[in-house]
């Protein structure tokens, strides 16, 4: 009889431990949920306020039609320039039209004067074809004016109102491009 009572008591104690564990898990889960909810709310708030304050382009970027442009203040080789743009959610400038070229060169004149700026144009080593970074061909009027005599990889850059070519390992400023945010209003 005593053994039976002792067994029941042990079972009850085991049940109690399990329930305590479950309660602890539940409390922990509830706390975690509350924290996540708080975090989510903060994130949403943040997103909403930044969406509310957002202009089509980030600070220090220039807008023209559907694009935003960033003119770098540092020099780098072409490949590093490409990575610097990606870091900002953009790519090296891809000039689609004479109008865009005019806008860029006009803006550069106002900002910095006559320096060299890498754009997203490079020459295929085998075929010698010029291609933008997305693989598309430049329109005939937007081909670099002079063929670089470099044995190394050749990339395109803008200077004054011309598109020129140079060894990709030389140091230049660069221009990044990203799509402008569409206004939801």
């Amino acid at each position: 009889k005593l053994l039976q009572v002792s067994t029941i008591a042990m079972q009850q104690q085991e049940k109690l431990i399990q329930q305590e564990r479950a309660l602890l898990n539940f409390t922990e889960w509830k706390r975690s949920c509350a924290l996540q909810m708080k975090y989510c709310q903060a994130f949403m708030q943040n997103s909403l306020s930044s969406a509310h304050n957002s202009s089509p382009c980030p600070n220090n970027w220039i807008q023209n039609r559907e694009s935003c442009y960033y003119v770098s203040e540092i020099w780098s080789i072409w490949h590093t320039s490409q990575e610097n743009c990606l870091k900002e959610g953009s790519t090296l400038l891809q000039i689609e039209s004479k109008e865009e070229m005019d806008f860029i060169t006009g803006s550069l004149r106002k900002i910095k004067g006559s320096y060299d700026y890498w754009v997203g144009l490079s020459q295929d080593g085998h075929s010698g074809r010029w291609l933008w970074q997305d693989g598309s061909s430049p329109s005939p009027g937007l081909l670099p004016a002079e063929r670089s005599q470099s044995a190394n990889q050749v990339c395109g850059y803008v200077k004054s109102n011309s598109l020129l070519s140079s060894n990709c390992s030389t140091w230049k400023y660069f221009i990044c491009e990203k799509y402008a945010l569409r206004s939801s209003v």
């Epitope: 994130f43 990606l86 870091k87 900002e88 959610g89 953009s90 790519t91 970074q133 997305d134 693989g135 491009e177 990203k178 799509y179």
Partner: nanobody, 116 residues
Framework: QVQLQESGGGLVQTGGSLRLSCAAS????????MGWYRQAPGKQRELVAA???????TYADSAKGRFTISRENTRNTVHLQMSSLKAEDTADYYC??????????WGQGTQVTVSS
């Protein structure tokens, strides 16, 4: 912390195709860009292709016309479809992501071997 999990690497014949995938997880809501680098034995790591959050694309010269990068917004996943593979495409391929705070994270890498 952000985790990147690559898959799809393997052994393929010259001229064959392969599709690499990379899924980002962890504390990530959105990103600035995602892409692929590769490193062949004894060579420097080089950018193969990348896609920005706005959908802008960039490819290495060696990838143009043969490789296509795409992404699934809903799952923070990026794919690299590689076709007309050559022996010189043999390398370890690493997925990378640039987050909103401009940090760059890397995956562990997946091996691609193109045999003739």
């Amino acid at each position: 912390q952000v985790q990147l999990q690559e898959s799809g690497g393997g052994l393929v014949q010259t001229g064959g195709s392969l599709r690499l995938s990379c899924a980002a997880s962890g504390s990530i809501f959105s990103f600035n860009a995602m892409g692929w680098y590769r490193q062949a034995p004894g060579k420097q790591r080089e950018l193969v292709a990348a896609i920005t959050d706005g959908g802008r694309l960039t490819y290495a010269d060696s990838a143009k016309g043969r490789f296509t990068i795409s992404r699934e917004n809903t799952r923070n996943t990026v794919h690299l479809q590689m076709s007309s593979l050559k022996a010189e495409d043999t390398a370890d391929y690493y997925c990378t992501i640039w987050t909103r705070d401009r940090q760059q994270y890397w995956g562990q890498g997946t091996q691609v071997t193109v045999s003739s």
